[in-house]
Every structure is written in structure tokens, then in C-alpha cells.
Amino acid sequence: GIAIPRNSGCPNSEDKNFPRTVMVNLNIHNRNTSTNPKRSSDYYNRSTSPWNLHRNEDPERYPSVIWEAKCRHLGCVKADGNVDYHMNSVPIQQEILVLRREPRHCPNSFRLEKILVSVGCTCVTPIVHHVA
Amino acid sequence: GIAIPRNSGCPNSEDKNFPRTVMVNLNIHNRNTSTNPKRSSDYYNRSTSPWNLHRNEDPERYPSVIWEAKCRHLGCVKADGNVDYHMNSVPIQQEILVLRREPRHCPNSFRLEKILVSVGCTCVTPIVHHVA
């Protein structure tokens, strides 16, 4: 983060906790002004590296529901619908921030947590290791 | 989230703000115990729908740096290295949570914000619209 001389309009924080513990307003502001109908909604079926989405719910986490991608095949789907095992379907992973209730069950106290989620899959050329 | 009769060990919150404003510890806990060096690191080059990563920095946001994927081609790369325009490279997008300083420049007050980021690209069969 950044440390800027305190505005008089800023909520106060005791320096001993600063900037470790901050106040966060949970009323989410959505920057995606127009709901993008494309998003990734049908790509999981149309991709040459198709994936299934699995629901992961954890009430101690915020957001409590995360959908995780799992590639359907080791290889990639060819135009004829068969799987080409000379190519690899691999998950595209991203580290995201979530809020974890801490202490557990406390309704208004959280800790930032980084988790790795698989968002979708892509088809890559495999790395071939040549043995001498 | 969950609301359970308040633990005596929970930080207090005034009901008028509850559960809108919460305390968040910014000392990030990393659930990804072993940093996977593979992750998606080289997929952006090896993919049949390769992408470039663009740095997006915003000091009023936490995390301040986000890397965004942009597909290199409209089509997908074939085994011979040429681009097949009968297929489409498309971005895989994900909605993620970030913290936005609010009021602006305040070091210890944030609001949750949802933003749509492109994580990588995948190769899909195009949707063909047949005209009668």
C-alpha cells in the first residue's frame, strides 16, 4: 500500500496497528459497469482445452463461493472432436485476495488471504525433455 | 458470511455499521504453501492462444499492481506456427475483489471493489451465425 500524510477526513487509526489493520466497507462497488454477457460463460465448452467448473463454498471466507476450473482432458480437442495427446490442456491459475474470518466465526473481523484458483484452461505445446 | 452470537474474543462493531464495515488484517496469509514455480508462468508463450501481460498500477487500490492478459492474435496458433483464423483466441476473465482507498488517499480506510481481469487466453471454436 501507500502511506500518505493523513487527511483530516480519514478515519483514525492507532499507530501501533497501522497499517496492519484497516477498516473495510463490504458494500461492494462494481467497476464492471455493463454486465459483459460474453465474460467466460460459454468458453469452457467451446475451448480446445475445455474445463468443468467446481463449486467451492467456505462460510468462513469472503466471498464464500468460488468456482474452480478443472481441465477435462490431458490433451486438447481437435476439430474432429478427438483428443490430441501431443498437446496439453493446462489450468490458467491466478492468485486472488479473499477475506478469511479471524478469529473464526467473528462476523466483523477478517484477515487478507491469498489463494490460488484455476480460472480456465488453455492448450499448450508440451515441453519435451530429450534424453541423451 | 455468518452471524453467530458474538464471541467475547471478537472485535466490537457498532450495529449501525454492521456488517458493512469490518476490520481487516492486511498481513496476508498465503494459502499456497509451496510457491509453484510452474504456475501459469510460461503458458502465455506456449499456448495456442498466446498472450502478453500488461502491468496495471493504481496506488489507490490494493493490490496496487495487477497484470492483465491481452491475446496476441484473433486466431489460434497452429503446429507450424501460423495463425488459424477459423479458431478464436479469447481472454478468460475473472471477477476479483480488490480494496479501494475510500475516502481517497486515506491510508487505513478501504472499500471492497469487484473488477474484471483477463487472466490468460484460450482457443475456442467460433460461433457461426448463419444468415437465412
Epitope: N30, S41, W67 | A3, P5
Partner: antibody
Framework: EVQLVQSGAEVKKPGASVKVSCKAS????????VHWVRQAPGQGLEWIGV????????AYNQKFEGRVTMTADTSTSTAYMELRSLRSDDTAVYYC????????????????WGQGTLVTVSS | EIVLTQSPDFQSVTPKEKVTITCSAS?????MHWFQQKPDQSPKLWIY???NLASGVPSRFSGSGSGTDYTLTINSLEAEDAATYYC?????????FGQGTKLEIK
């Protein structure tokens, strides 16, 4: 005002398929999952499954796996539930209901329900 | 799957009486939701995450419990409370509901 408006009643023959729609309004469609629940005449509630309109992710009750398909069209904020190979014991009122993925003042529960669609399976 | 068993199935109650409906789970669950349903109406969320009243629910209702045993209580029954009440768990797939408890006003 949050509303989930479902398609009208259907009468189907055994072995046929039915597709029920659920049009959402008054909220951001991709911020909530859509769950489907059914209720046979004079009986209790039975969970069929869920779709996340944002990702297209689905999770089905194993009892319906292979016979059910849930889809969502984010451009029209409409969710669909198709049930195939209908049997007489599929006669029920089918409800769609939303479930929050994010917070605000959300209860993380099925907080708004459609009016229900009666599906009658009879030869 | 987790089986939820409500008790009683049916109860005929006098106004102002205290009513207790129990929901017993075949395995431990994190939280319980409760829904109210009146004839020819869709279910309504009534109590969420064990003890929180949904918007518009009168304060005479309360919920409690943990593990396998959960309770919905009406402190002083009113005529408008006549309905069927269902408990519901979301701790494991498939999500399941209790068979329902029908409350009738004497």
C-alpha cells in the same frame, strides 16, 4: 425490486423434456447463483442443482445427474433448467431461487424465489 | 446425503402459545436455514445461518442450535404464523430440506 419470474405451466408426456425459464430483475444477475428446487404435490422441497451465471459453473444433485441441464443467458438475465426423460414422479412445482456470491447485506441463503412452474407429466 | 428430520410433522397450536420445531441432521452441519411456506405460495427465507431473522420476520421468531440439532422457536404464536416450516442444510451435497412441519392455529 428483486423479482424472479418463471415460465408458465407445462404438461408433458413420459419420456419428453421440459425447459423452464427464470427471468431475473432488480439485481446484478452475475452476483448471485441460481438454484433450482422442486416440490411434488403435497410433498416437501427437493434441491435439484445450481448454476453460477457468471462462469457457467453448475453443480447438480446426483439424483438428477444426466437428466438435467442448467444454463444461463447473461444478456437477458435468464436462467434455464431442462429436465429430460420425464417420468410421472417428476410432476412437481419447479422453483428458481437466487443465492448470493458476494456480500453487501446478503444472507448467503436462498433469499428470493420465483413464483414456481407446475410441470405435469402424464400419458 | 444428509437427512434432516423435523419434529413434529404437524402441530395444532393456540394463539399466544410458545412453539418449538426441531430439526435433527444425520451428520453434523455448520448452519441451518429455515423457510416458511403458505399454501399456493413460494417458500420464503425465514431464518438464515441458524439464528438470523430474514428481512420482515417478526422478532417473536428465533433460531438456535449447532452440530446435528437445531431449533426454530415462536415465542407467542399469532394467526399469521400458520404455515409449513422447512429446515435446510448447505454443508454438503446434495443440499437437503427437512420434510416440513405444518403449524395449524386452533
Amino acid at each position: 425490486e428483486v423479482q424472479l419470474v418463471q415460465s408458465g405451466a407445462e404438461v408433458k408426456k413420459p419420456g419428453a423434456s421440459v425447459k423452464v425459464s427464470c427471468k431475473a430483475s432488480g439485481y446484478t444477475f452475475t452476483d448471485y447463483e441460481v438454484h433450482w428446487v422442486r416440490q411434488a404435490p403435497g410433498q416437501g422441497l427437493e434441491w435439484i442443482g445450481v448454476i453460477d451465471p457468471g462462469t457457467g459453473g453448475v453443480a447438480y444433485n446426483q439424483k438428477f445427474e444426466g437428466r438435467v441441464t442448467m444454463t444461463a443467458d447473461t444478456s437477458t438475465s435468464t436462467a434455464y433448467m431442462e429436465l429430460r426423460s420425464l417420468r410421472s414422479d417428476d410432476t412437481a412445482v419447479y422453483y428458481c431461487t437466487r443465492y448470493s456470491l458476494f456480500y453487501g447485506s446478503s444472507p448467503y441463503a436462498m433469499d428470493y424465489w420465483g413464483q414456481g412452474t407446475l410441470v405435469t407429466v402424464s400419458s | 446425503e444428509i437427512v434432516l428430520t423435523q419434529s413434529p410433522d404437524f402441530q395444532s397450536v393456540t394463539p399466544k402459545e410458545k412453539v418449538t420445531i426441531t430439526c435433527s441432521a444425520s451428520s453434523s452441519v455448520n448452519y441451518m436455514h429455515w423457510f416458511q411456506q403458505k399454501p399456493d405460495q413460494s417458500p420464503k427465507l425465514w431464518i438464515y445461518r441458524t439464528s438470523n431473522l430474514a428481512s420482515g420476520v417478526p422478532s417473536r421468531f428465533s433460531g438456535s442450535g449447532s452440530g446435528t440439532d437445531y431449533t426454530l422457536t415462536i415465542n407467542s404464536l399469532e394467526a399469521e404464523d400458520a404455515a409449513t416450516y422447512y429446515c435446510q442444510q448447505r454443508s454438503s451435497y446434495p443440499w437437503t430440506f427437512g420434510q416440513g412441519t405444518k403449524l395449524e392455529i386452533k
